[in-house]
């Protein structure tokens, strides 16, 4: 009667421990589906912000920082006020960002289109020789393919021209202690899906 | 997918205004400048001037100043070219390009005025 | 104002043929050039900045080198679409201004 009783025993313990490795199955499925769900829900909080940012230049879904551009995957802020360049990489970091790293061909455009004054101010990027006469890197230490923009010497500037500033959509080397205005730039964060709630009263207004 | 769509065609007499409008979409107005350029029937390609999308500052080469008005809508995405007492060598297409004045990577589809008493 | 003088004019080839446009600036323009072609009744297309290079999704059968005042655009082995008018414009400050243009015609 007791081995019976064990041996029924043996059956519900195996059972249960069935059950629990099902169960265990249908959770691990559950958190899979849930990721991948999230990821979906990211990437279209993530569109439709784009779409609310590019109508209006501004959005709260935005995930920049208040007064910061949101560019491609980056937000950006164009300062007036003129710094030496490496007071400017002193200010990004102040701010929990660096200078202006140009990548690729629409982040000139933009820099350009933003940077661009009837009244000749340049601002500095994160490019620097920090060997007099050698390569050109960014800040990150990433080098400069000259593909993407031609640096002219600017041969007035009485020092060393290691420091590269952008002047209306042309790209000068200049004495890093001139004065040009800053350029900061920080990765764009995750743009919440909860900022997106729109009151059911907006609906189909402006469209 | 960004698109720069302008308006259709317009037939003016001489002294008449025309307002052209140039709607982009597929990124933020507001990140690059808009630059006009005209082109002349058979003829090349000239640069007007561009407004700031960001201050709404217009700037106009030396031959479009006077009779000629950048604005925006920038809630519509929208730039707006003017051309106010039309004269006959205003018969042309007019472009909208994208970007600060450098290249232009996307153009408008151009709207022809023609002027014609 | 900077000048841009494009030759020739006018130009015939065949398809499969490789044809070279110049253009030349009045002053330097550093490698500030870019070109575009149009065809007609079209808007013009963007081919090529910094004066060597090539727009995203252009065919690398177009090619630009030069510097200074000195630029041309090379066309390898041409295909039936490339056909039209090419315009090089510098982008050195303002005002920008374009070549009269040079238009590629099928022999």
């Known amino acids: 009667q007791y081995y019976q009783l064990s041996n029924t025993g043996q059956d519900t313990i195996s059972q249960m421990e069935e059950r629990l490795g099902n169960t265990s199955q249908e959770l691990q499925s559950l958190q899979v589906q849930n990721i991948k769900l999230a990821g979906s829900l990211q990437h279209v909080a993530e569109k439709l912000c784009r779409e609310l940012y590019n109508k209006a230049g501004a959005h709260r879904c935005s995930p920049c920082t208040e007064q910061w551009k949101w560019h491609g995957d980056n937000c950006y802020q164009f300062y007036k006020d003129s710094k030496s360049w490496e007071d400017c990489k002193y200010f990004c970091l102040s701010e929990n960002s660096t200078m202006l790293k140009i990548n690729k061909q629409e982040d000139l455009e933009f820099a350009a289109s933003q940077s661009y004054s009837e009244f000749f101010y340049s601002y500095w990027t994160g490019l620097l020789r920090p060997d007099s006469g050698k390569a050109w890197l960014w800040m990150d230490g990433t080098p400069f393919t000259s593909e993407l923009f031609h640096i002219i010497i600017d041969v007035t500037s009485p020092r060393s021209r290691d420091c590269v500033a952008i002047l209306n959509g042309m790209i000068f080397s200049k004495d890093c202690k001139e004065l040009k205005r800053c350029v900061c730039e920080r990765r764009a964060g995750m743009v919440k899906p909860e900022s997106l709630h729109v009151p059911p009263e907006t609906l189909g207004e402006g469209d | 997918q960004i698109h720069l769509v302008q308006s259709g065609p317009e037939l003016k007499k001489p002294g008449e205004t025309v307002k052209i409008s140039c709607k982009a979409s597929g990124y933020t107005f507001t990140n690059f400048g808009m630059n006009w350029v005209k082109q002349a029937p058979g003829k090349g390609l000239k640069w007007m001037g561009w407004?700031?999308?960001?201050?709404?500052?217009?700037t106009y080469a030396d031959d479009f100043k006077g009779r000629f008005a950048f604005s925006l809508e920038t809630s519509a995405s929208t730039a707006y070219l003017q051309i106010n007492n039309l004269k006959n060598e205003d018969t042309a297409t007019y472009f909208c390009?994208?970007?600060?004045?450098?290249?232009?990577?996307?153009w408008g589809q151009g709207t022809l005025v023609t002027v014609s008493a | 104002d900077i000048q841009m003088t494009q030759s020739p004019a006018s130009l015939s080839a065949s398809v499969g043929e490789t044809v070279t446009i110049t253009c030349r600036a009045t002053?330097?323009?550093?490698?500030?050039l870019a070109w575009y072609q149009q065809k007609q009744g079209k808007s013009p297309q963007f081919l090529v900045y910094n004066a060597k290079t090539l727009a995203e999704g252009m065919p690398s059968r177009f090619s630009g080198s030069g510097s200074g005042t000195q630029f041309s655009l090379k066309i390898n082995i041409l295909q039936p679409e490339d056909f039209g008018t090419y315009y090089c414009?510098?982008?050195?400050?303002?005002?920008?201004?374009f070549g009269a243009g040079t238009k590629l015609e099928l022999k």
């Open positions: 002053e330097n323009i550093y490698s500030y």
């Open positions: 407004i700031n999308t960001n201050t709404g500052e217009p």
């Open positions: 390009a994208r970007g600060a004045p450098a290249w232009f990577t996307y």
């Open positions: 414009q510098h982008h050195f400050g303002t005002p920008l201004t």
